[in-house]
Amino acid sequence: QKSSIEKCSVDIQQSRNKTTERPGLLNCPIYWQQLREKCLLFSHTVNPWNNSLADCSTKESSLLLIRDKDELIHTQNLIRDKAILFWIGLNFSLSEKNWKWINGSFLNSNDLEIRGDAKENSCISISQTSVYSEYCSTEIRWICQKELTPVRNKVYPDS
Amino acid sequence: QKSSIEKCSVDIQQSRNKTTERPGLLNCPIYWQQLREKCLLFSHTVNPWNNSLADCSTKESSLLLIRDKDELIHTQNLIRDKAILFWIGLNFSLSEKNWKWINGSFLNSNDLEIRGDAKENSCISISQTSVYSEYCSTEIRWICQKELTPVRNKVYPDS
């Protein structure tokens, strides 16, 4: 029996013989749509932001993270109705007084032109044409993402 | 050029030639440790519970969900230091006055013996020996999980 110290909370020894490539998805599952190197799931039903975050998490995916304006536009092109809003993985951090992605990075102010206030309990939604600040308790649709292609030597350090 | 309606927010037609099998992980990525049919990542840095939930999500994983006492014990055996606490995917639902897993299910009271209060802004952490209720704003380590084995025809229902 190994001691708990030898076991170690992250037993890298075990992983020595394992792939350092994240297997990833080779294809998008049913209900998910491919957009470049991601699979996206556009929900039909609605949830507050927190529940949307949890739903994506239980699907082993993430609320949508948008890299730049180009990715925003390509995502918006997949939204079929002007009136529909979708939560993405961006909300207002009161302590840092800034918009923060759920991966811990801050919004580059050039990336998204947000309509609405930057204040406590504000979360970001996108529509076919715009980006909005909404109360996080609002029930709207949401977008989950999974990375599609295998990513080599991506080791998921702490955010 | 397809109309936005034909593109549809989730164009399942594209997925027709794609697998309906969720590929899953065949091996745990580096830094993750296998425990039965799961890969676990024990963080080294600390975060409030909400940020921990978000971090797991961006890693396309979930805060740890514990099925029963047996799984709890096996997980605790991997914790190397008695003094370290780790967030798991369980918090107090004020509206339902009950402990709730992030997949929406309620805690079976026999599963975990929780030390501390069941009240607003309480989240659950585990140590090498115990299960604690802590203020969700407390910055401690956390555990993410990924399912290891491929699951056929799983369109991501309940965990």
């Epitope: 049913i30 | 309606i5 164009d11 027709r16």
Partner: antibody, heavy 121, light 107 residues
Amino acid sequence: EVQLLESGGGLVQPGGSLRLSCAASGFTFERYAMSWVRQAPGKGLEWVSAISAVGGTTKYADSVKGRFTISRDNSKNTLYLQMNSLRAEDTAVYYCAKPLDSSLWADFDAWGRGTLVTVSS
Amino acid sequence: DIQLTQSPSSVSASVGDRVTITCRASQGISSWLAWYQQKPGKAPKLLIYAASGLQSGVPSRFSGSGSGTDFTLTISSLQPEDFATYYCQQASYLPITFGGGTKVEIK
């Protein structure tokens, strides 16, 4: 195993009211939008109403709008349908139904056995 | 509202036959179509989701195809337990709507 069990049906006069319940088990009820679907004797299926997972958003078929109210109690894993101003054409078996995925309103992979509502004088 | 028109409304067939049922939507619904089987006195049972996804536990003799407005449910070799009524359902837009049903009877 997912189980949905409807109750509350029965005979009621036109203009009367009934409250249907659906007790859910075997899945995390509160992650899913839920629906009521009905089937008149010898007829096809008709979607009646849906409610979001949290319960703040409700949707209705035009035929019942303003008369029926859908609600849920996630702490009791129970779905409800309050039916007022009932008409003869509301006579049907009422099913509660769960969607296959938590992101969907429909594609129902679990149904109750149904409860019969008869509106007649 | 989106109308779904099923054809035929009934079909007589023998065990072993190949049976095809069609469902036409009044406007494009991408692949947001499901198929159900219902037997007398029973609740419907999901067979196919997302136009072509076979629901877990459903025999592989059932298959679905189509996209946009025209969809097909095929039973490759009819079995005695397949005699029932079949419904299509669209989930692309609310209100959710069902087709009128196709009754598969013994010849």
